[in-house]
């Protein structure tokens, strides 16, 4: 499978909601042996690969924002990032998404998506999404983000 | 705050079998790999194999596929390290690290001292 | 296995020096390297993550760079604190691997 942006770049107006979404396509290893992890935090363009470093969002780190597989149990403070305006959703058609509530211009950057599959006995499987969020300041509460393709945005996948 | 607390430091014959505990706080234990790495005087560091809490993947070393065995318990945020067979090659100090998937190995404990002597 | 070649055991400096530690790997592993810091009678702590980038709360008198099979360490500044020694890992396969290590004495 390879994980893809459905957009790759997302303009909002400070206080609306921002919605990021990835998307894994194609077939996902099945049985009881496999298990997908996802999760999100932001980085930087760098300049060799993109989604290289690491850095919270809104304060909470990578192992915080999981998508959570069978295997893995949900955290103990699972509510936590969701009081501080984090969301995550997934749904059966490999869609996953990370919504920030009431953005302002503080949390513009870089967001990476990052799909491990985990197979016992197996190396990891890493495959990374990347999109940019822009959020404008003091623009009014009744415009909406926008999201746009500003260029192909298939991610790259590395081992 | 995210700790790794590693048990009490062990003198034991050659032959014998040590059992080495990890204990996690600070975070979800299922959600990180814990990763075990041994230190020998003047031998640097070396990567023994790694285990995901509450899926019981692993992955060892080749080199340690038959001395090492590793273990985790959920209910206790503990994961375990079972060393067989002793002889003096196996003294080293022997330390448990936390590995988010797609990651570093960012929290490490203190160290377990393990000396086989007979 | 790929291995992780440091090519000085120990390297002698002085406070407010700038010193520079290199590694090597047997093949290409991009920049999916670590750099740790192991003082004495301590545990490993991690420095630098994908071959330059700071782990939260590591001063920014220390730096990495690289990506490919050539990777540099490089601390700006030498403090006093900084005797140490220390090690690159790549984290591109199983099995991880680290470098032999390189011991930072201060004159």
């Known amino acids: 499978f390879k994980v893809t942006t459905p957009y790759s770049l997302y303009v909002c107006p400070e206080g609306q909601n921002a919605t990021l979404t990835c998307r894994i396509l194609g077939p996902v290893s099945k049985g009881h042996d496999v298990t997908i992890y996802k999760t999100w935090y932001l980085s930087s363009r760098g300049e060799v690969q993109m989604c290289k470093e690491h850095r919270p969002i809104r304060n909470f780190t990578l192992q915080h924002l999981q998508h959570h597989g069978s295997h893995l149990k949900a955290n103990a403070s699972h509510d936590q990032p969701q009081k501080h305006g984090l969301e995550l959703a997934s749904d059966h058609h490999g869609n996953f998404s990370i919504t920030l509530r009431n953005v302002t211009p503080r949390d513009s950057g870089l967001y990476c998506c990052l799909v491990i599959e985990l197979k016992n006995h197996h190396p990891e499987q890493r495959f990374y999404g990347s999109m940019e969020l822009q959020v404008q300041a003091g623009k009014g509460s009744g415009s909406t983000c926008m999201a746009s393709n500003e260029q192909d945005s298939d991610s790259i996948t590395a081992a | 705050q995210v700790q790794l607390q590693q048990s009490g430091a062990e003198l034991m014959k050659p032959g014998a079998s040590v059992k080495i505990s990890c204990t996690a706080t600070g975070y979800t234990f299922s959600s990180c790999w814990i990763e075990w790495v041994k230190q020998r005087p003047g031998h640097g560091l070396e990567w023994l194999g790694e285990?995901?809490?509450?899926?019981?993947?692993?992955n060892y070393n080749e080199k340690f596929k038959d001395k090492a065995t590793f273990t985790a318990d959920t209910s206790s945020d503990t994961a375990y390290m079972q060393l067989s067979s002793l002889t003096s090659e196996d003294s080293a100090v022997y330390y448990c690290a936390r590995r988010p998937p797609g990651w570093y190995f960012d929290v490490w404990g203190a160290g377990t001292a393990v000396t086989v002597s007979s | 296995d790929i291995v992780m070649t440091q090519s000085h055991k120990f390297m002698s400096t002085s406070v407010g020096d700038r010193v520079s530690i290199t590694c090597k790997a047997s093949q290409d592993v991009s920049t999916d390297i670590a750099w740790y810091q192991q003082k004495p009678g301590q545990s490993p702590k991690l420095l630098i993550y994908s071959a330059s980038y700071r782990f939260t709360g590591v001063p920014d008198r220390f730096t990495g760079s690289g990506s490919g099979t050539d990777f540099t360490f490089t601390i700006s500044s030498v403090q006093a604190e900084d005797l140490a020694v220390y090690y690159c890992q790549h984290q591109y396969s199983t099995p991880w691997t680290f470098g032999g290590g390189t011991k930072l004495d201060i004159k």
């Open positions: 285990i995901l809490p509450g899926s019981d993947y692993t």
